[in-house]
């Protein structure tokens, strides 16, 4: 404890929850001679105190909303009050609790939206504030639409961003809103703190009135603009128009380009401001925005498409400074040596980028010029006149002209003459045996090393070996990487192995050269090898199709109604048995075979909704492995709870005799779901005979006043029956009794003679 709650004077930070204990000692600082006492300065707010002995404490509960951090300084003083140590900073961080409710900034909001506005684009924000810490759930607000009126075919036209309070259209709203059919809507919005996730969250509601207006704000047709235009800029290319005059137009470059060559004027005319370069960017998509005078968007942005038309302003380019090819000695005429692929930045598949190839020089011209030819359009080099001999000329250099319709470029090709590829790769083993792997072996694992050798000229295409799997792996689960120095092949796992689809694979490898074999030499059995891959089963648990299954039913559904279903599959193909776990209320049963879920008891939203249970899928046979998912049953409210008194009203009394008519206030409630702003109860006397003595009048949706009509009451208890109607569908009525006693009073309380048996009323009216 010594080190944790006491110690030397040094900078420290303490975190303390607000509103908790009214006082606590935080720490005891220990003085070193000649220090004998301590002094506290800074943001103490008369809450933080330090004792002479170094005890730092606070003397009343903290409030984060008043001050979230207290910056204090502690110094050690000697007997003369001189600072001998410090001052050192002491920081008190006040941690938040949820002690503030969210409040909408307005009790009513009004807004308008154009028909066909883009779904998801806010046209109105509701805003609530909560004094609690927004970095904690206490101050994290969650907005919801409680109801939309009217609601046509049960379709929501509006949605709210539950974090920002932004109201926008749904996809259906964007498509179906029509001012001719329905020009106005009302939404009731709720806000909760705790991110809406806690039963203990605080909430508030507000009302939103929305007008739907006609829309002429539409995207123009795509525009085509020739690149490198020499016309004077800016050039008008298209236009947009807002529905009403006075809009402020702007363009938004969603791509955040380093240069954005478009502008818009206050008429809505759109211009290109400088010549465009198709090779820099061949198309632009940007947005036209209309805002009101306060800079608030009036509607969704319009997408403007500009396509840049190509001109031939780029020469061909070579693939590299020198392109190297190999050709074997004694190769036959017409054999392909390689393809020179030049590039042109102009638009593909147009005359501007269509290339021609022509050999302009061969060096050396030994034994003659014109040994090579190039296909005019394809760029493929071929042997034209005769076979080559390495000892005569081991290397040729070609200059090739590549041209489009306006430009010419010279590219350089080096052709190395190599030994003939008359040796095939030979595997050191023809059979690499059996390999047994579990189906969950990691992707990327090297599972086998294979080796072939080739006696041709080293480090040429004649001796380089490429390994291919030619049989036994149609799924492409395996691959072979080759080490270019050693020609060693590493067999790796590229895709997960699967016992269920391929328990045994008979794999055949082929070893090949990138260079063609000399005429008359063919790959034979020596260039092939095999191995057998045996995959063992790893028993996997069944897999649910969803992590959470959700269903919605009315709380009054008949017993035996199907309320939902779940599905799972077993990777091994075993049958699955479904069961429920955590059905604490005994409301549900599941069909073990189909996964259908049925009600087996009356459901009750007021007991809690959604009702959450776990569903378990278990293999039938095998290892009986199982997996678990959630089933959430959302219960929709039915008006099935009559109104009742909100609290116990025994003990109401009037002092007898009444000097003037009196009254008392009572509150009603019920357990059903109340949209809008709470219940709307109506109140009346429970029987006609009471009307001579009593009167009941509504104060608001939940409170009413019971008044006496005269002063002539006997000294006894009266039981007044009150009828409370909830106005629901169907309307439910509760008859409640308010016991009211008229009694002799002493100092404002009922006087009871000794021995009186009934309870003494405690509330005077």
């Amino acid at each position: 404890q010594e080190g944790k709650f006491s110690g030397p004077l040094k900078p420290m930070t303490f975190s303390i929850y607000e509103g908790q204990e009214p006082s606590q000692i935080i720490f005891q600082f220990k003085a070193n001679p000649p220090a004998v006492t301590f002094e506290l300065t800074g943001e103490t707010d008369n809450i933080f105190v330090i004792e002479r002995e170094g005890l730092l404490y606070y003397n009343r509960a903290l409030d984060r909303e008043t001050r979230s951090t207290h910056n204090l300084q502690v110094a050690a003083l000697d007997a003369n009050g001189i600072i001998v140590e410090g001052p050192v900073p002491i920081t008190i961080k006040v941690k938040d609790i949820n002690d503030n409710r969210p409040t909408f900034l307005q009790s009513k909001y009004e807004g308008s939206v154009r028909q066909n506005s883009r779904p998801g684009k806010p046209f109105l924000y509701v805003n609530a504030t909560d004094l609690d810490d927004p970095a904690t759930p206490n101050g994290q607000l969650y907005y919801q639409i409680v109801i939309q009126l009217p609601m046509i075919n049960n379709v929501m036209y509006f949605q709210i961003n539950n974090k920002t309070g932004a109201i926008s259209l749904t996809r259906e709203g964007s498509q179906e809103l029509n001012p001719a059919k329905n020009p106005s809507y009302n939404l009731v919005i709720s806000v909760k703190d705790m991110g809406g996730q806690s039963e203990n969250s605080f909430s508030d509601t507000t009302s939103v009135d929305i007008i739907v207006t006609e829309n002429i704000w539409k995207a123009p047709k795509p525009v085509e603009m020739v690149e490198n235009s020499t016309d004077p800029h800016p050039i008008k290319i298209t236009q947009v128009r807002w529905n009403d005059p006075g809009a402020q137009y702007s363009l938004v470059d969603k791509e955040k380009l380093p240069r954005f060559p478009f502008s818009i004027d206050q008429e809505g005319d759109i211009y290109v401001t400088q010549p465009l370069d198709r090779e820099e960017k061949d198309a632009y998509v940007f947005y036209a925005v209309a805002k009101d005078e306060y800079g608030k968007p009036l509607s969704y942005p319009l997408e403007i498409h500009v396509k840049v038309k190509d001109i031939n302003d780029n020469p061909p380019t070579c693939p590299s400074p020198v392109t190297v090819f190999e050709v074997q000695e004694n190769e036959r005429l017409g054999n392909s040596i390689g393809t020179l692929t030049a590039h042109d930045r102009d638009e593909e598949n147009t005359a501007n980028s269509f290339l021609n190839y022509r050999i302009v020089e061969q060096t050396p011209k030994l034994p003659m010029d014109g040994l090579f030819l190039i296909q005019t359009y394809a760029g493929m080099l071929q042997l034209a006149k005769q076979s080559l001999k390495k000892q005569d000329t081991p290397q040729y250099n070609l200059t090739i002209e590549v041209s489009d319709k306006d430009f010419k470029t010279l590219c350089f090709v080096q052709i190395n003459v190599i030994d003939i590829n008359d040796q095939i790769p030979i595997f050191e083993k023809s059979d690499y045996g059996n390999l047994t792997l579990a189906e969950d072996t990691n992707i990327g694992s090297t599972i086998l090393t294979i080796q072939a050798t080739d006696a041709d000229e080293p480090f040429t295409g004649s001796s380089k070996i490429l390994y291919h799997i030619i049989k036994g792996d149609s799924e492409g689960r395996l691959g072979v990487d080759t080490d270019p120095h050693t020609n060693t092949g590493y067999v790796i796992i590229k895709k997960p192995l699967d016992f269920e689809t391929a328990a045994v694979s008979n794999i055949v490898f082929k070893a090949e050269n990138p260079e063609p074999l000399v005429f008359g030499v063919k790959y034979n059995a020596s260039s092939f090898a095999k191995f057998t891959l045996i995959v063992t089963d790893v028993n996997e648990a069944p897999q649910f199709s969803q992590h959470v299954f959700q269903a919605k039913v009315s709380e009054d559904v008949a017993i035996g109604t199907k309320v939902g279903n779940v599905t799972a599959k077993d990777p091994e193909g075993l049958d699955i048995s479904y069961s429920l776990r955590g059905d604490t209320r005994g409301w549900l049963k599941i069909d073990h075979v189909t996964g259908e879920i049925f009600s087996v008891a009356p459901l009750d939203r007021e007991a809690g909704s959604p009702y959450r249970v776990q569903v378990v899928a278990t293999e039938v046979g095998g290892s009986s492995l199982s997996s678990v998912s959630e089933f959430h049953l959302i219960l929709m409210d039915v008006n099935d709870n009559p109104p009742r008194l909100a609290k116990d009203y025994t003990g109401l009394f009037f002092c007898h005799p009444l000097s003037a008519p009196g009254s008392l206030i009572f509150e009603a409630t019920d357990d059903d779901q109340h949209l809008f702003r709470g219940p709307h109860f109506t109140f009346s006397l429970g029987s006609g005979s009471l009307q001579n003595d009593w009167e009941v009048s509504k104060i608001n949706g939940t409170h009413a006043r019971l008044s006496t009509r005269h002063t002539e009451f006997e000294e006894r208890e009266y039981v007044v029956l009150i009828r409370i109607n909830d106005g629901g569908r169907p309307p439910l009525e509760g008859i409640v009794s308010l016991p009211v006693t008229f009694c002799s009073c002493v100092e404002g309380s009922c006087f009871r003679p000794a021995g009186h048996q009934t309870g003494i009323p405690t509330v005077g009216m």
């Epitope: 009214p22 006082s23 606590q24 000692i25 008369n46 809450i47 404490y57 003397n59």
Partner: nanobody, 114 residues
Framework: EVQLLESGGGLVQPGGSLRLSCAAS????????MGWYRQAPGKEREFVAA???????WYADSVKGRATISRDNAKNTVYLQLNSLRPEDTAVYYC????????WGQGTQVTVSS
Amino acid sequence: EVQLLESGGGLVQPGGSLRLSCAASGGTVSGYAMGWYRQAPGKEREFVAAINSGGPTWYADSVKGRATISRDNAKNTVYLQLNSLRPEDTAVYYCRRYDDYDSWGQGTQVTVSS
């Protein structure tokens, strides 16, 4: 305003033990830091021990190992157990609630003498 009433003091021989009690009325000890202080004749009042609502305790070096502070929130009482008493422990012992009124008791006399 809370009233703090100390009891349990008296005359005790050196080496003996004593348990002081501090009962609160008109207020609570629950949630508050509570402390014991003492004042010997002719000297300044000095800190003896303190306890938080959650349990951590502090002691003056002069009583460390011989004193134990504890609390019973249900009884609204704080205790100070003093063992191996010495003549220099003779003083009036005061109970304190660390609050914004800085509430103190009237004190109880402890005399250690043979």
